[in-house]
């Protein structure tokens, strides 16, 4: 089949990095500068992606593969193949159309991207707040208030009760 195809279509012999040049009797010609073909048998070469402005070059274009971009520092990639660059914010902030804004009270963001999320509600799990939340950090939940009887440690749970007269097992 391959042999038949190549007899019928001389372009199928053109390897990646070349194109089948109709203007030159279907000779395989190298891709021109700033273009590439990643598969054989192509009749045109594709224009290389340009990484400029908010984008910077992660991998140069070659005759057989497209350039790959990432984002200039201060921005991060979004989408497949880094199709977009989005602004970084500081921890404790979220990105809005007005730029980076501080998280509202009761919310936090511990990353340079993403949105502010509500602090964990410890009481929903029957626990108490061990460490208060901030704009950058979630609250830390501790044991339930019932466990915090006078004299008990707030971190170590009380030892299991033993019947009098019994030695430890």
């Amino acid at each position: 089949f391959e042999r038949t195809r190549s007899l019928q279509d001389p372009c199928s012999n053109c390897p990646a990095g070349t194109f089948c040049d109709n203007n030159r009797n279907q000779i395989c010609s190298p891709c021109p500068p700033n273009s590439f073909s990643s598969a054989g048998g192509q009749r045109t070469c594709d224009i290389c992606r340009q990484c400029k402005g908010v984008f910077r070059t992660r991998k140069e274009c070659s005759s057989t593969s497209n350039a790959e971009c990432d984002c200039t520092p201060g921005f991060h990639c979004l989408g497949a193949g880094c199709s977009m660059c989005e602004q970084d914010c500081k921890q404790g902030q979220e990105l809005t159309k007005k730029g980076c804004k501080d998280c509202c009270f009761g919310t936090f963001n511990d990353q340079k991207r993403g949105i502010c999320r509500p602090w964990t509600n410890c009481s929903l799990d029957g626990k108490s707040v061990l460490v208060n939340g901030t704009k950058e950090r979630d609250v830390v939940c501790g044991p339930s208030p019932a466990d915090l009887s006078p004299g008990a440690s707030s971190v170590t749970p009380p030892a299991p009760a033993r019947e009098p007269g019994h030695s430890p097992q």
């Epitope: 402005g53 979004l78 199709s83 989005e86 990105l95």
Partner: nanobody
Framework: EVQLVESGGGLVQPGGSLRLSCAAS?????NYWMNWVRQAPGKGLEW???????????YYVDSVKGRFTISRDNAKNSLYLQMNSLRAEDTAVYFC????????????????SGQGTTVTVSS
Amino acid sequence: EVQLVESGGGLVQPGGSLRLSCAASGFTLSNYWMNWVRQAPGKGLEWVANINQDGSERYYVDSVKGRFTISRDNAKNSLYLQMNSLRAEDTAVYFCARGGEGYGVDHYGLDVSGQGTTVTVSS
């Protein structure tokens, strides 16, 4: 081909003014949010301002509020940045950039930007 080309940069004294322009081609400008971002020497990229499709919403980074004005002329496929009361810290390469599909709804990503125009503020 989708393209953005900035112009209007130059050397200006502190307190002076400049007007940057950005010519868009290969797409319909009026369909997109547009942005200006800048990169000072040796620093990361900083968002400066944005403007919605019809120009009714405009937002600025705190450091340029009251000094810079972003505007657009969709009929001319152009974006502008009027820069007044320039300071040494405004020295940077300025890029115009298009907000990607869904900008302001799902994300604030920029999908196309130009080569930039250099603004130098010095006495």
